[in-house]
């Protein structure tokens, strides 16, 4: 298999679409409730499913990015020159196996996702064939944040990014030359993927997120909407 520089399969078939090959918009996913034999998903299972849906979407966006530019071949050194302050998990955040702390970790996950929102806004209009997918990733991340906020006990510890700072950052990013914009897009997708994977590993450590329903297959990820919360 030919892989891009970050270890993704470029020719990997991404199952991020619903059965009828259309993305499921918010509030239109009735399949989970329609099937009588299915157990209703717990909130933790829904969070798990939501993250997997977003990760499938990111893979699709990365596929387009890698196909149209050589950014995926760029070395870490070149990427490091792009001084984006993207959220990243660290040992102190309590999300790793050693030093795991459920409350601290949950705060970090929510804070990180809130910080990623401006970058997900930047990604809109950055894709041609996957424009709808980019919107779906953005919208489902908003829903994921709401899910997690309902789960968190210590909401006071969560810092919300300043809208003015975000607006100015967005303007700055959009004013970059084409090469830097391509690099920024690649870096955001790669970092967001890593952050979500770190989050999912941590969430699966948390007590009530041990098993998923038998019918919950990764190849049938669907967008979970606010009405499902």
């Amino acid at each position: 298999d030919y892989k891009d520089h970050d270890g993704d399969y470029k020719d990997h078939d991404i199952d991020y679409k619903d059965d009828d090959d259309k993305l499921v918009p918010p509030g239109e996913d009735s399949k989970d409730v329609a099937a009588p034999h299915r157990q209703p998903l717990t909130s933790s299972e829904r969070i798990d499913k939501q993250i997997r849906y977003i990760l499938d979407g990111i893979s699709a966006l990365r596929k387009e990015t890698c196909n149209k530019s050589n950014m995926c071949e760029s070395s870490k050194e070149a990427l490091a020159e792009n001084n984006l302050n993207l959220p990243k998990m660290a040992e102190k955040d309590g999300c790793f196996q050693s030093g795991f702390n459920e409350e601290t970790c949950l705060v970090k996950i929510i804070t990180g996702l809130l910080e990623f929102e401006v970058y997900l806004e930047y990604l809109q209009n950055r894709f041609e064939s996957s424009e709808e997918q980019a919107r779906a990733v953005q919208m489902s991340t908003k829903v994921l944040i709401q899910f997690l906020q309902k789960k968190a006990k210590n909401l006071d510890a969560i810092t919300t990014p300043d809208p003015t700072t975000n607006a100015s950052l967005l303007t700055k990013l959009q004013a970059q030359n084409q090469w830097l914009q391509d690099m920024t897009t690649h870096l955001i997708l790669r970092s967001f993927k890593e952050f979500l994977q770190s989050s999912l590993r941590a969430l699966r450590q948390m007590g009530d997120l041990i098993s998923v329903p038998v019918d919950s297959r990764g190849s049938e990820q669907k967008l979970i909407s606010e009405e499902d919360l």
Partner: antibody, heavy 121, light 110 residues
Framework: EVQLVESGGGLVQPGGSLRLSCTVS????????MSWVRQAPGKGLEWVGY???????WYANWAKGRFTISRDNSKNTLYLQMNSLRAEDTAVYYC???????????????WGQGTLVTVSS | DIQLTQSPSFLSASVGDRVTITCQAS??????LSWYQQKPGKAPKLLIY???TLTSGVPSRFSGSGSGTEFTLTISSLQPEDFATYYC????????????FGGGTKVEIK
Amino acid sequence: EVQLVESGGGLVQPGGSLRLSCTVSGIDLSSYDMSWVRQAPGKGLEWVGYIYTDSSTWYANWAKGRFTISRDNSKNTLYLQMNSLRAEDTAVYYCARGSTDYAFDTRLDLWGQGTLVTVSS
Amino acid sequence: DIQLTQSPSFLSASVGDRVTITCQASQSISNELSWYQQKPGKAPKLLIYRASTLTSGVPSRFSGSGSGTEFTLTISSLQPEDFATYYCQQGYNSNDVDNVFGGGTKVEIK
């Protein structure tokens, strides 16, 4: 050509320590999730642990506290530090490159040839 | 603690036979399962991931199916080079587990 080459195996006494190395060529190690897997003579595969690109490490229950996985991206090398070794740790130790879609679904698509560790007095 | 049970442990078959190996998880693992082939003295080789996706370069006689707790690896027509040991690997949770691999199934010549 992408290659993983393990080294550092050999004979060690019970209670002793050993550090295995896995030198990676042809790829940027920092971009990949990595794993150590071992296989005792005539037995099945036994997972030791993972190190992910976020720098987190995850270990099998039996390996926690005794084994440590680390990486030096500048040297493109993965390590396995093994302490308080026992006879039952005798095995061929493999390093493997992983690709992960979600959380722990790390498919190990490239393996080294393995290095034999013998724990005996 | 997720455990994988492979059956059978040993399987005798002839060239041309259809061979089925099962892997059962102690709890649901979605479709987060991979299959490996290992020949004596060699490192394992990835065959299938995400329960049913064939790795590039692996012959189409190999197929994987299943979701949740029950998974199957099928070799539609056994070839001489397929005599080996096969392992499943779960990828749902690696926290609080003793092993992510199943015990293995050795496919021998009848």
